[in-house]
Interface confidence: low
């Protein structure tokens, strides 16, 4: 299958979704976001060994060329394949507003 | 601007489009592709320093958390923002066929 799901490095070490707890201060948002005070940021972390969750043909090419020219071509990288929306309560001049961000939390991951 | 385009590492060192010349053998395609014999593979290579070509909010978060927790959270990664199509002449049981691949050659790059 194009999108191999077996991680040769051991479980949890290849590209997958991780949760990182972050405060508004960590994110540099304290001056413009009221809530939530803490965000469970889902992000894509892990190695992308040969053909693991290859997103597309480009990722497969990258794997082949990285094997041949590791100093020139980097290995594929673990990035979001899609996102979950998140609502932030923001400070405004007149009070507060609710804003939905569609590109904030990773939903699932692939290698590209 | 959210997507800063100034590379603090020096010209050409940050995330951008590069061309890598590759033969069918390099790509492992010699058994199923007839033409072209050589591909000018456009791919995204380079560093993603703070806010450089940040693709979205997620990339900005990643930058912030990488600064705080560099061992846990990787820096954003240079990946294709879009692709150029490419036509391959493929071998088939009955002869040859033309197949267009939409996800083969990077067109432009961003950090995510």
């Amino acid at each position: 299958a194009r999108n191999g799901d077996h991680c040769p490095l051991g479980p949890g070490r290849c590209c997958r979704l991780h949760t990182v707890r972050a405060s508004l201060e960590d994110l540099g948002w304290a001056d413009w976001v009221l809530s939530p005070r803490e965000v469970q940021v889902t992000m894509c972390i892990g190695a992308c060994p040969s053909q693991f969750r290859a997103a597309n043909m480009h990722a497969q090419i990258k794997t082949s060329l990285h094997r041949l020219k590791p100093d020139t071509v980097p290995a594929p990288c673990c990035v979001p394949a899609s996102y979950n929306p998140m609502v932030l309560i923001q400070k405004t001049d007149t009070g507060v507003s609710l804003q939905t961000y569609d590109d904030l939390l990773a939903k699932d991951c692939h290698c590209i | 601007a959210r997507n800063g385009d100034h590379c603090p590492l020096g010209p050409g060192r940050c995330c951008r489009l590069h061309t890598v010349r590759a033969s069918l053998e390099d790509l492992g395609w010699a058994d199923w592709v007839l033409s072209p014999r050589e591909v000018q593979v456009t791919m995204c290579i380079g560093a993603c320093p703070s806010q450089f070509r940040a693709a979205n909010m997620h990339a900005q978060i990643k930058t912030s958390l990488h600064r705080l927790k560099p061992d846990t959270v990787p820096a954003p990664c240079c990946v294709p923002a879009s692709y150029n199509p490419m036509v391959l002449i493929q071998k088939t049981d009955t002869g040859v066929s033309l197949q267009t691949y939409d996800d083969l050659l990077a067109k432009d790059c961003h950090c995510i």
Epitope: A1, R2, D5, H6, G10, P11, H18, I45, K107 | -
Partner: antibody, heavy 119, light 107 residues
Framework: EVQLVQSGAEVKKPGASVKVSCKAS????????LNWVRQATGQGLEWMGD????????IYNQKFKGRVTMTVDTSISTAYMELSSLRSEDTAVYYC????????????WGQGTLVTVSS | DIQMTQSPSSLSASVGDRVTITCKAS??????LAWYQQKPGKAPKLLIY???SLETGVPSRFSGSGSGTDYTFTISSLQPEDIATYYC?????????FGGGTKVEIK
Amino acid sequence: EVQLVQSGAEVKKPGASVKVSCKASGYTFTDYNLNWVRQATGQGLEWMGDLNPYNQGIIYNQKFKGRVTMTVDTSISTAYMELSSLRSEDTAVYYCAREGRGGAWFDSWGQGTLVTVSS
Amino acid sequence: DIQMTQSPSSLSASVGDRVTITCKASEDIYHRLAWYQQKPGKAPKLLIYGATSLETGVPSRFSGSGSGTDYTFTISSLQPEDIATYYCQQYWSPPFTFGGGTKVEIK
């Protein structure tokens, strides 16, 4: 032989918390992710989240976000799932399940822990 | 979240019959599908993973097929001990989700 042994049944009042344990044996504990799945009486299966004992990476089902906490004690090969602010609809059998080597299918399951929430 | 729609919700068949259960995902899950058997009062038991791979020790009368969004689970010759509820589960994208289950009974 792989075994996952869970703690015993619990009866809790609404608003309380429950902590279920899952002791693993028969394999290298840090080599496999552990998941928690629940099943209300006569209902289907619902995934709550998973925990990587190697690096303590956790993915929670957003449905339970803020109410569920998954932890691990690698020294005794035991995983824990704590659910807070219990309500009657949390009455269910809670299972721990070991993830497969190549993906999040569940190849070994605990015997289940019945949690009853009743006033 | 990826929704898994399993059908039928129940079926009745005779010993020796071929039994087929289908599972439809709300988006492509790239073969990341498992099938489980659950008997009353017991934990689920893994039968199939990767849409088609038979778990070690599972009888060969159980099989799986499919791709994209559509998957099928088959018992080639129903046996009395196969009476149970069967669930599909996707593990392409968290939250990992299960189908609603199919209760298999003997006629």
